[in-house]
Interface confidence: medium
């Protein structure tokens, strides 16, 4: 159905509150440096305009596309050239080039300081004084730090955030109530951001086909009772939703996501027995619930895969006449039977099956050629299983911090050219896989670990793309989405690396280290570890363990000293000298 006014259509569909929130998120993701007040003003003006168009669709400019309206609005910002430099040149372009230009300037690492919450009393006063402004600030702060955050999900998290304050600001001990709840929400938000960034990278770097394959595998695992036609329909709609959000079309994205939730609830009988509870909720909670819904039970009577994909004499004919549909069916059938496999592994198996058919269907006797194809999957399955087993054993032995340090050493040796903050951030996140996945039952470990690693390694790829410094990282990031993790796992020590010159400044510490929260203290130590490795890449694990132990003792000693700063300036150089001697 064609609408006279696109903006009125979205305003009517989404309602004023969600519409305004999404516009605020969109502007904050595009113009990440602008102050909150400017964005509130822009969002208010756009919402007022949309409201007017909803009342009178043939009003002036109501027929313009959303990109035109939003782009025109962004280009009215006076400080565009000062704050954003060449992003201002985007305003010289016409749509759709102008929007593409804005998208290209989104900064995945804007370098804002971490959000520090004020005192609970001050927070509650702000919340109670102006709830709408308070939640708007939350949307703004998250959106500008995460320019690819999944916008409808961010509205959901803002709602959760509101619930936390509504509850805790009534509590006797506000701090005790807020602390753990805000931290739990923060963890969810960070994971959500990374997951959506992975989806956007899949679409932008590898195209619709890669994203659809990923979604077919994931949804087939989750909804094994749904047939392939149903899975395909949901995947097609889901692809459209994520393409829109990744492309900055947040109103269309949120609207289409709501439509998809409606469709799934209307057709739950043919999708999953687990959707009922989700479908009774309001739209934001409903969509979120559907996205997180537990896996349905497998149908009991699934025939052997071999019947259709190996033994059937028509395999090559079916494959050659509609390759993607046939491979999609294979992926669907394999995934619904193997909820314990990671999506990445399932996609590798589908790729292997495709390669086998490409080869075998060109021979004189295809059935003999592909007869053992399913048996040939074994090494592909064993590799992530062994990797998870080995790393979980290491995690259980070392704990999260020790495991992170082991990964820091591993990844710094693989790609020492990568910036130290990136190596620390990525290795810390990789280390969290232990905490997140190793305590899960065997049947869930691989899926949890490998799919989480894919998301974290995507962060490395995104950061590295901004300033490429390592050919091997570029190669692992760009050759194949499903083989990224095995590619990184397979990287050995970079023997071509020329050690970094020693810089005493890098290893100079001050008394402010003592007052840092534990996590930030760890980051400081881990930063030193990476710098040490860049200076002495041939250092053995034993040597590094000794030096890091000494470093920990030094920090503890000086933080307990009467004259902390004096201790740091006196003992620090001695420690550095001892470390250099130990690492010769």
């Amino acid at each position: 159905e064609a609408y006279k006014s696109e903006i009125a259509h979205r305003y009517n569909d989404l309602g004023e509150e969600h519409f305004r929130g999404l516009v605020l998120v969109a502007f904050s993701q595009y113009l990440q440096q602008c102050p909150f007040e400017d964005h509130v003003k822009l969002a208010k003006e756009v919402t007022e305009f949309a409201k007017a168009c909803a009342a009178e669709e043939s009003g002036a400019n109501c027929d313009k596309s959303l990109h035109t309206l939003f782009g025109d609005k962004l280009c009215t910002v006076a400080s565009l050239r000062d704050k954003y430099g060449d992003m201002a040149d985007c305003c010289e372009k016409q749509e759709p080039d102008r929007n593409e230009c804005f998208l290209a300037h989104k900064d995945d690492n804007p370098g804002f300081p971490p959000l520090v919450a004020p005192e609970p009393d001050a927070l509650c006063a702000a919340f109670q004084d102006n709830e709408q402004l308070f939640l708007g600030k939350y949307l703004y702060e998250i959106a500008r730090r995460h320019p690819y955050f999944y916008a409808p999900e961010l509205l959901y998290y803002a709602q959760q955030y509101k619930g936390v304050f509504a509850e805790c600001c009534q509590a006797a001990d506000k701090a005790a109530c807020l602390g753990p709840k805000i931290e739990a929400l923060r963890e969810k938000v960070l994971l959500s951001s990374a997951k959506e960034r992975f989806k956007c990278a899949s679409l932008q770097k590898f195209g619709d086909r890669a994203f659809k394959a990923w979604s077919v595998a994931r949804l087939s695992q989750r909804f094994p009772k749904a047939d392939f036609a149903e899975i395909s329909k949901v995947v097609t709609d889901l692809t459209k939703v994520h393409k829109e959000c990744c492309h900055g079309d947040l109103l269309e994205c949120a609207d289409d996501r709501a439509d998809l939730a409606k469709y799934m609830c209307e057709n739950q009988d043919s999708i999953s027995t687990k959707l009922k509870e989700c479908c009774d909720k309001p739209v934001l909670e409903k969509s979120q619930c559907l996205a997180e819904v537990e896996r349905d039970e497998l149908p009991g009577d699934l025939p052997s895969l071999a019947a259709d994909f190996v033994e059937d004499k028509e395999v090559c004919k079916n494959y050659q006449e509609a390759k993607d549909v046939f491979l999609g069916t294979f992926l669907y059938e394999y995934a619904r039977r193997h909820p314990e496999y990671s999506v990445s592994l399932l996609l590798r198996l589908a790729k292997e099956y495709e390669a086998t058919l490409e080869k075998c269907c060109a021979t004189d006797d295809p059935p003999t050629c592909y007869a053992k194809v399913l048996d040939e999957f074994k090494p592909l399955v064993d590799e992530p299983q062994n990797l998870v087993k080995t790393n979980c054993e290491l995690f259980e032995k070392l704990g999260e911090y020790g495991f992170q340090n082991a990964l820091l050493v591993r990844y710094t040796k693989k790609a020492p050219q990568v910036s130290t903050p990136t190596l620390v951030e990525v290795s810390r996140k990789l280390g969290k896989v232990g905490t997140k996945c190793c305590k899960k039952p065997e049947s869930e470990r691989m899926s949890c670990a490998e799919d989480f690693l894919s998301v974290v390694l995507n962060r490395l790829c995104v950061l590295h793309e901004k300033t490429p410094v390592s050919e091997r990282v570029t190669k692992c990031c760009s050759e194949s989405l499903v083989n990224r993790r095995p590619c990184f796992s397979g990287l050995e020590v970079d023997e071509t690396y020329v050690p970094k010159e020693f810089n005493a400044e890098t290893f100079t510490f001050h008394a402010d280290l003592c007052t840092l929260p534990e996590a930030e203290k760890q980051v400081k130590k881990q930063t030193a570890l990476v710098e040490l490795l860049k200076h002495k890449p041939k250092a053995t694990d034993e040597q590094l363990k000794t030096v890091m132990g000494d470093f920990g003792a030094f920090v503890e000693k000086c933080c307990a000293a009467e004259n902390k700063e004096g201790c740091f300036s006196e003992e620090g150089p001695k420690l550095v000298a001892a470390a250099q001697a130990a690492l010769v």
Epitope: D227, E314, N318
Partner: nanobody, 126 residues
Framework: EVQLLESGGGLVQPGGSLRLSCAAS????????VAWFRQAPGKEREFVAG????????TYADSVKGRFTISRDNSKNTLYLQMNSLRPEDTAVYYC???????????????????WGQGTLVTVSS
Amino acid sequence: EVQLLESGGGLVQPGGSLRLSCAASGRYIDETAVAWFRQAPGKEREFVAGIGGGVDITTYADSVKGRFTISRDNSKNTLYLQMNSLRPEDTAVYYCAARPGRPLITSKVADLYPYWGQGTLVTVSS
């Protein structure tokens, strides 16, 4: 659930033609892999022809290739089997079978089809 109802069977002379129909309800036929099987008295049920869901990929048993044509009309949610140059050995009860949500895969193995019609008898005799 898919319900299938065959029609169009009957008595025909050798060399003659018949067109069988299979009306489907409960599911769109274009989303479904559908096939015709037949069973002669005292024999196993055998695959005759199949057509994939979503993409019209057709498959035939060697014994009917060039004589039989499988097709479907999505608007009528109906599957057809046009049978020409009929022979006495084509005498059998013809069944329509469906595998919902399985584009392409028109397997020749009867056990893989969960939905069946009640059959229509075709007799080829002079």
